[in-house]
Protein backbone atom coordinates (compact mmCIF):
# COMPACT_ATOMS: atom_id res chain seq x y z
CA UNK A 1 0.00 0.00 0.00
CA UNK A 2 1.30 3.48 -0.78
CA UNK A 3 2.28 5.74 2.09
CA UNK A 4 2.52 9.44 2.69
CA UNK A 5 5.74 11.41 2.37
CA UNK A 6 6.72 15.06 2.62
CA UNK A 7 9.61 17.40 1.86
CA UNK A 8 11.21 19.25 4.75
CA UNK A 9 14.32 20.71 6.25
CA UNK A 10 15.50 20.02 9.79
CA UNK A 11 17.25 22.32 12.22
CA UNK A 12 18.59 21.34 15.62
CA UNK A 13 17.31 23.06 18.76
CA UNK A 14 20.15 25.58 18.51
CA UNK A 15 18.90 26.48 15.01
CA UNK A 16 21.82 24.88 13.21
CA UNK A 17 20.96 23.74 9.70
CA UNK A 18 22.04 20.47 8.10
CA UNK A 19 24.18 20.56 4.95
CA UNK A 20 26.13 18.04 2.90
CA UNK A 21 29.74 17.53 3.89
CA UNK A 22 31.22 15.44 1.12
CA UNK A 23 29.16 12.80 -0.70
CA UNK A 24 28.09 10.68 2.30
CA UNK A 25 28.06 12.91 5.36
CA UNK A 26 25.95 15.67 6.86
CA UNK A 27 27.19 18.47 9.09
CA UNK A 28 25.37 21.04 11.22
CA UNK A 29 26.09 24.74 11.18
CA UNK A 30 24.37 28.10 11.47
CA UNK A 31 23.25 29.50 8.13
CA UNK A 32 21.77 32.86 7.24
CA UNK A 33 20.30 34.57 4.20
CA UNK A 34 21.10 33.02 0.84
CA UNK A 35 23.29 30.40 2.49
CA UNK A 36 20.06 28.78 3.72
CA UNK A 37 19.74 27.33 0.21
CA UNK A 38 22.63 25.00 1.07
CA UNK A 39 20.57 23.10 3.64
CA UNK A 40 19.59 19.56 2.82
CA UNK A 41 15.99 18.88 1.84
CA UNK A 42 14.73 15.60 3.24
CA UNK A 43 12.01 13.40 1.86
CA UNK A 44 10.45 11.98 5.01
CA UNK A 45 8.26 8.91 4.48
CA UNK A 46 5.97 6.98 6.77
CA UNK A 47 7.14 3.37 6.91
CA UNK A 48 6.25 0.14 8.64
CA UNK A 49 7.71 -0.20 12.10
CA UNK A 50 7.23 -1.58 15.57
CA UNK A 51 4.24 -0.26 17.50
CA UNK A 52 4.80 2.21 20.29
CA UNK A 53 2.45 4.88 21.64
CA UNK A 54 4.18 8.11 20.70
CA UNK A 55 6.68 6.87 18.14
CA UNK A 56 5.98 7.10 14.43
CA UNK A 57 8.30 5.13 12.11
CA UNK A 58 9.80 7.16 9.27
CA UNK A 59 12.60 6.98 6.71
CA UNK A 60 14.72 10.02 5.90
CA UNK A 61 15.87 10.26 2.32
CA UNK A 62 17.58 13.16 0.62
CA UNK A 63 15.17 14.71 -1.86
CA UNK A 64 15.89 13.74 -5.47
CA UNK A 65 18.99 11.81 -4.42
CA UNK A 66 19.25 8.06 -3.99
CA UNK A 67 20.52 8.48 -0.45
CA UNK A 68 18.92 7.52 2.85
CA UNK A 69 20.07 7.95 6.42
CA UNK A 70 20.83 4.54 7.86
CA UNK A 71 22.18 3.10 11.09
CA UNK A 72 24.86 0.40 11.05
CA UNK A 73 27.53 -0.99 13.33
CA UNK A 74 31.01 0.30 12.58
CA UNK A 75 33.82 -0.87 14.82
CA UNK A 76 31.13 -2.22 17.18
CA UNK A 77 29.50 1.22 17.51
CA UNK A 78 26.09 2.28 16.16
CA UNK A 79 26.86 4.75 13.40
CA UNK A 80 24.82 7.09 11.22
CA UNK A 81 25.58 7.05 7.52
CA UNK A 82 24.16 8.11 4.17
CA UNK A 83 23.52 4.99 2.15
CA UNK A 84 23.01 4.83 -1.59
CA UNK A 85 19.96 2.84 -2.74
CA UNK A 86 18.44 1.66 -6.01
CA UNK A 87 15.88 4.33 -6.95
CA UNK A 88 13.67 1.71 -8.60
CA UNK A 89 13.02 0.10 -5.21
CA UNK A 90 12.92 3.06 -2.82
CA UNK A 91 11.11 4.47 -0.98
CA UNK A 92 8.93 1.56 0.08
CA UNK A 93 6.58 0.92 2.97
CA UNK A 94 8.63 -1.93 4.41
CA UNK A 95 12.07 -0.38 4.65
CA UNK A 96 14.96 -2.38 6.07
CA UNK A 97 15.32 -1.69 9.77
CA UNK A 98 18.59 0.22 9.41
CA UNK A 99 16.67 2.92 7.49
CA UNK A 100 13.89 3.28 10.05
CA UNK A 101 13.76 6.03 12.68
CA UNK A 102 11.12 6.35 15.36
CA UNK A 103 9.98 9.96 15.19
CA UNK A 104 9.01 11.30 18.60
CA UNK A 105 7.15 14.60 18.41
CA UNK A 106 6.57 16.65 21.55
CA UNK A 107 5.69 20.37 21.58
CA UNK A 108 6.89 20.86 18.00
CA UNK A 109 10.25 19.30 18.84
CA UNK A 110 11.25 16.11 17.00
CA UNK A 111 13.60 13.34 18.01
CA UNK A 112 14.68 10.55 15.70
CA UNK A 113 15.50 7.31 17.46
CA UNK A 114 17.16 4.53 15.51
CA UNK A 115 14.83 1.54 15.19
CA UNK A 116 17.87 -0.69 14.76
CA UNK A 117 19.57 0.66 17.89
CA UNK A 118 16.99 1.73 20.51
CA UNK A 119 18.00 4.76 22.61
CA UNK A 120 20.40 5.97 19.93
CA UNK A 121 19.36 9.24 18.32
CA UNK A 122 20.25 11.41 15.38
CA UNK A 123 22.43 14.01 17.07
CA UNK A 124 24.47 17.14 16.50
CA UNK A 125 27.33 18.62 18.46
CA UNK A 126 27.23 21.93 20.28
CA UNK A 127 30.20 22.93 18.14
CA UNK A 128 29.78 24.43 14.69
CA UNK A 129 30.48 22.56 11.45
CA UNK A 130 30.62 19.10 13.01
CA UNK A 131 29.17 15.89 11.52
CA UNK A 132 25.63 14.78 12.25
CA UNK A 133 25.95 11.49 14.10
CA UNK A 134 24.16 8.76 16.03
CA UNK A 135 24.41 9.45 19.74
CA UNK A 136 23.64 7.18 22.66
CA UNK A 137 22.75 9.87 25.18
CA UNK A 138 19.79 12.20 25.48
CA UNK A 139 19.75 15.36 27.56
CA UNK A 140 23.52 15.64 27.67
CA UNK A 141 25.88 17.93 25.77
CA UNK A 142 24.87 16.65 22.37
CA UNK A 143 21.67 17.86 20.73
CA UNK A 144 18.90 15.39 19.87
CA UNK A 145 15.97 17.81 19.41
CA UNK A 146 15.07 19.14 15.98
CA UNK A 147 12.45 21.34 14.40
CA UNK A 148 10.98 20.63 10.99
CA UNK A 149 10.06 23.11 8.28
CA UNK A 150 8.03 22.18 5.21
CA UNK A 151 9.69 23.07 1.92
CA UNK A 152 7.61 25.02 -0.59
CA UNK A 153 8.20 23.75 -4.09
Amino acid sequence: APVRSLNCTLRDSQQKSLVMSGPYELKALHLQGQDMEQQVVFSMSFVQGEESNDKIPVALGLKEKNLYLSCVLKDDKPTLQLESVDPKNYPKKKMEKRFVFNKIEINNKLEFESAQFPNWYISTSQAENMPVFLGGTKGGQDITDFTMQFVSS
Partner: antibody, heavy 119, light 108 residues
Framework: EVQLVESGGGLVQPGGSLRLSCTAS????????MAWVRQAPGKGLEWVGI???????YYASWAKGRFTISRDTSKNTVYLQMNSLRAEDTAVYYC?????????????WGQGTLVTVSS | EIVMTQSPSTLSASVGDRVTITCQAS??????LSWYQQKPGKAPKLLIY???TLASGVPSRFSGSGSGTEFTLTISSLQPDDFATYYC??????????FGQGTKLTVL
Protein backbone atom coordinates in the same frame (compact mmCIF):
# COMPACT_ATOMS: atom_id res chain seq x y z
CA GLU B 1 -5.07 30.77 21.91
CA VAL B 2 -4.52 27.83 19.56
CA GLN B 3 -7.43 27.60 17.15
CA LEU B 4 -8.62 27.08 13.58
CA VAL B 5 -11.28 29.19 11.89
CA GLU B 6 -12.92 28.14 8.63
CA SER B 7 -14.64 30.55 6.27
CA GLY B 8 -15.93 30.73 2.73
CA GLY B 9 -18.94 28.45 2.97
CA GLY B 10 -22.32 29.34 1.52
CA LEU B 11 -24.82 28.53 -1.19
CA VAL B 12 -23.49 27.54 -4.61
CA GLN B 13 -25.19 26.21 -7.70
CA PRO B 14 -24.49 22.69 -9.05
CA GLY B 15 -21.44 22.80 -11.31
CA GLY B 16 -20.10 25.84 -9.50
CA SER B 17 -16.90 26.38 -7.53
CA LEU B 18 -16.07 27.52 -4.03
CA ARG B 19 -12.86 28.11 -2.07
CA LEU B 20 -12.84 27.51 1.65
CA SER B 21 -10.22 29.00 3.96
CA CYS B 22 -8.86 27.74 7.28
CA THR B 23 -6.80 30.23 9.25
CA ALA B 24 -4.66 29.06 12.14
CA SER B 25 -3.77 31.12 15.18
CA UNK B 26 -1.48 30.26 18.07
CA UNK B 27 0.79 28.05 15.94
CA UNK B 28 2.58 28.14 12.58
CA UNK B 29 1.41 26.19 9.57
CA UNK B 30 5.02 25.97 8.34
CA UNK B 31 5.37 22.62 10.08
CA UNK B 32 1.77 21.51 10.70
CA UNK B 33 -0.08 19.00 8.55
CA MET B 34 -3.64 20.12 7.85
CA ALA B 35 -6.60 18.05 6.72
CA TRP B 36 -10.14 18.71 5.54
CA VAL B 37 -12.99 16.52 6.75
CA ARG B 38 -16.63 16.94 5.78
CA GLN B 39 -19.98 15.89 7.21
CA ALA B 40 -23.20 15.84 5.19
CA PRO B 41 -26.35 16.79 7.16
CA GLY B 42 -27.28 13.94 9.50
CA LYS B 43 -24.43 11.77 8.17
CA GLY B 44 -21.00 10.64 9.32
CA LEU B 45 -17.50 12.07 8.94
CA GLU B 46 -15.73 11.80 5.58
CA TRP B 47 -12.05 12.53 5.01
CA VAL B 48 -11.33 14.83 2.07
CA GLY B 49 -7.54 15.15 2.07
CA ILE B 50 -4.39 16.39 3.78
CA UNK B 51 -1.51 18.74 2.96
CA UNK B 52 2.08 18.74 4.21
CA UNK B 53 4.38 20.84 2.06
CA UNK B 54 2.81 22.32 -1.06
CA UNK B 55 3.97 19.37 -3.17
CA UNK B 56 2.75 16.71 -0.76
CA UNK B 57 -1.03 16.52 -0.79
CA TYR B 58 -3.15 13.38 -0.46
CA TYR B 59 -6.83 12.97 -1.23
CA ALA B 60 -9.72 10.58 -0.80
CA SER B 61 -10.29 8.80 -4.12
CA TRP B 62 -13.63 10.53 -4.67
CA ALA B 63 -12.05 13.99 -4.20
CA LYS B 64 -9.18 13.63 -6.68
CA GLY B 65 -9.53 15.92 -9.66
CA ARG B 66 -12.34 18.06 -8.23
CA PHE B 67 -10.90 19.20 -4.91
CA THR B 68 -7.51 20.82 -4.33
CA ILE B 69 -5.85 21.63 -1.02
CA SER B 70 -3.24 24.38 -0.90
CA ARG B 71 -1.57 26.54 1.71
CA ASP B 72 -0.20 30.06 2.14
CA THR B 73 2.25 29.97 5.01
CA SER B 74 2.63 33.76 5.02
CA LYS B 75 -1.10 34.06 5.80
CA ASN B 76 -1.07 30.98 8.06
CA THR B 77 -3.99 29.71 5.99
CA VAL B 78 -4.96 26.48 4.26
CA TYR B 79 -7.46 26.39 1.41
CA LEU B 80 -9.86 23.87 -0.09
CA GLN B 81 -10.74 24.64 -3.71
CA MET B 82 -13.89 22.76 -4.75
CA ASN B 83 -14.91 22.56 -8.41
CA SER B 84 -17.79 20.96 -10.34
CA LEU B 85 -19.85 20.89 -7.17
CA ARG B 86 -22.78 18.50 -6.84
CA ALA B 87 -25.74 18.31 -4.48
CA GLU B 88 -24.00 15.46 -2.63
CA ASP B 89 -21.13 17.81 -1.71
CA THR B 90 -23.50 19.66 0.62
CA ALA B 91 -21.88 19.35 4.04
CA VAL B 92 -20.18 21.07 6.92
CA TYR B 93 -16.48 21.24 6.06
CA TYR B 94 -13.98 21.10 8.91
CA CYS B 95 -10.26 21.72 8.83
CA UNK B 96 -8.17 19.83 11.36
CA UNK B 97 -4.55 19.63 12.42
CA UNK B 98 -2.78 16.28 12.42
CA UNK B 99 -1.67 15.48 15.97
CA UNK B 100 1.86 14.60 14.83
CA UNK B 101 3.33 14.23 11.37
CA UNK B 102 2.01 10.94 9.89
CA UNK B 103 -0.02 10.14 13.01
CA UNK B 104 -3.12 10.27 10.83
CA UNK B 105 -5.32 11.46 13.71
CA UNK B 106 -6.61 14.96 14.32
CA UNK B 107 -6.42 16.77 17.63
CA UNK B 108 -7.42 20.34 16.76
CA TRP B 109 -10.55 21.11 14.74
CA GLY B 110 -12.20 24.25 13.46
CA GLN B 111 -15.86 25.02 14.03
CA GLY B 112 -16.79 24.06 10.47
CA THR B 113 -18.30 25.98 7.58
CA LEU B 114 -21.49 24.92 5.80
CA VAL B 115 -21.49 24.46 2.03
CA THR B 116 -24.88 24.07 0.36
CA VAL B 117 -25.02 23.01 -3.29
CA SER B 118 -28.47 23.69 -4.67
CA SER B 119 -30.18 25.40 -7.57
CA GLU C 1 -9.23 1.55 0.07
CA ILE C 2 -9.78 0.66 3.70
CA VAL C 3 -13.38 0.44 4.93
CA MET C 4 -14.15 0.92 8.62
CA THR C 5 -17.31 -0.72 9.97
CA GLN C 6 -18.73 0.17 13.38
CA SER C 7 -21.32 -1.68 15.41
CA PRO C 8 -23.85 -1.05 16.66
CA SER C 9 -25.13 1.98 14.72
CA THR C 10 -27.17 3.07 17.71
CA LEU C 11 -26.85 2.11 21.34
CA SER C 12 -29.16 2.96 24.23
CA ALA C 13 -27.80 2.89 27.75
CA SER C 14 -28.19 4.43 31.18
CA VAL C 15 -25.89 6.52 33.35
CA GLY C 16 -23.50 4.19 35.16
CA ASP C 17 -23.63 1.49 32.48
CA ARG C 18 -20.54 -0.04 30.90
CA VAL C 19 -20.77 0.24 27.14
CA THR C 20 -18.66 -1.16 24.33
CA ILE C 21 -18.50 -0.09 20.69
CA THR C 22 -16.66 -2.19 18.12
CA CYS C 23 -14.87 -1.21 14.93
CA GLN C 24 -13.66 -3.50 12.18
CA ALA C 25 -11.14 -2.59 9.49
CA SER C 26 -11.35 -4.23 6.07
CA UNK C 27 -7.60 -4.93 6.24
CA UNK C 28 -4.99 -4.94 8.97
CA UNK C 29 -4.11 -1.48 10.26
CA UNK C 30 -1.87 -2.68 13.09
CA UNK C 31 -2.62 -0.29 15.99
CA UNK C 32 -3.31 2.75 13.83
CA LEU C 33 -6.85 3.34 15.07
CA SER C 34 -8.38 6.48 16.60
CA TRP C 35 -11.70 7.18 18.30
CA TYR C 36 -13.61 10.48 18.28
CA GLN C 37 -16.62 11.82 20.15
CA GLN C 38 -18.99 14.27 18.47
CA LYS C 39 -21.90 16.21 19.91
CA PRO C 40 -24.61 17.83 17.75
CA GLY C 41 -23.46 21.03 16.07
CA LYS C 42 -19.89 20.60 17.35
CA ALA C 43 -16.61 19.46 15.83
CA PRO C 44 -15.32 15.97 16.65
CA LYS C 45 -13.03 15.52 19.64
CA LEU C 46 -10.13 13.07 19.65
CA LEU C 47 -10.53 10.55 22.48
CA ILE C 48 -8.05 7.78 21.79
CA TYR C 49 -5.17 7.26 19.37
CA UNK C 50 -2.91 4.33 18.55
CA UNK C 51 -5.84 2.06 19.56
CA UNK C 52 -5.38 2.51 23.31
CA THR C 53 -3.68 5.82 24.16
CA LEU C 54 -5.92 8.39 25.81
CA ALA C 55 -5.73 11.86 24.26
CA SER C 56 -4.92 14.75 26.57
CA GLY C 57 -7.72 15.65 28.97
CA VAL C 58 -9.87 12.60 28.22
CA PRO C 59 -11.34 10.95 31.35
CA SER C 60 -9.96 7.53 32.31
CA ARG C 61 -13.41 5.91 32.04
CA PHE C 62 -12.71 5.79 28.29
CA SER C 63 -10.45 3.00 27.07
CA GLY C 64 -9.56 1.44 23.76
CA SER C 65 -8.15 -1.92 22.75
CA GLY C 66 -7.46 -4.10 19.75
CA SER C 67 -5.04 -4.43 16.87
CA GLY C 68 -5.05 -5.69 13.32
CA THR C 69 -8.67 -5.50 12.19
CA GLU C 70 -10.73 -5.64 15.42
CA PHE C 71 -10.99 -2.74 17.86
CA THR C 72 -13.19 -1.71 20.77
CA LEU C 73 -14.00 1.49 22.64
CA THR C 74 -15.25 1.00 26.19
CA ILE C 75 -16.80 3.51 28.56
CA SER C 76 -16.58 1.93 31.98
CA SER C 77 -19.28 3.96 33.73
CA LEU C 78 -21.42 6.13 31.51
CA GLN C 79 -21.78 9.78 32.54
CA PRO C 80 -24.47 12.23 31.32
CA ASP C 81 -21.86 14.07 29.25
CA ASP C 82 -21.01 10.88 27.30
CA PHE C 83 -24.22 10.71 25.25
CA ALA C 84 -22.93 11.56 21.78
CA THR C 85 -21.91 9.96 18.50
CA TYR C 86 -18.63 8.03 18.38
CA TYR C 87 -16.48 7.43 15.31
CA CYS C 88 -13.51 5.18 14.71
CA UNK C 89 -10.88 6.09 12.10
CA UNK C 90 -7.89 4.35 10.62
CA UNK C 91 -4.81 6.48 11.22
CA UNK C 92 -1.08 6.38 10.53
CA UNK C 93 0.64 7.45 7.35
CA UNK C 94 -1.15 5.35 4.79
CA UNK C 95 -2.51 7.31 1.85
CA UNK C 96 -6.15 6.49 2.58
CA UNK C 97 -7.97 7.64 5.72
CA UNK C 98 -11.50 6.45 6.51
CA PHE C 99 -14.01 6.90 9.30
CA GLY C 100 -16.54 4.40 10.54
CA GLN C 101 -20.19 5.27 9.98
CA GLY C 102 -20.62 6.27 13.62
CA THR C 103 -22.37 4.92 16.72
CA LYS C 104 -25.03 7.10 18.30
CA LEU C 105 -25.17 6.62 22.06
CA THR C 106 -28.57 7.62 23.46
CA VAL C 107 -30.30 7.60 26.85
CA LEU C 108 -32.30 4.43 27.56
Amino acid sequence: EVQLVESGGGLVQPGGSLRLSCTASGFSLSSAAMAWVRQAPGKGLEWVGIIYDSASTYYASWAKGRFTISRDTSKNTVYLQMNSLRAEDTAVYYCARERAIFSGDFVLWGQGTLVTVSS
Amino acid sequence: EIVMTQSPSTLSASVGDRVTITCQASQSISSWLSWYQQKPGKAPKLLIYKASTLASGVPSRFSGSGSGTEFTLTISSLQPDDFATYYCQNAGGGVSIAFGQGTKLTVL
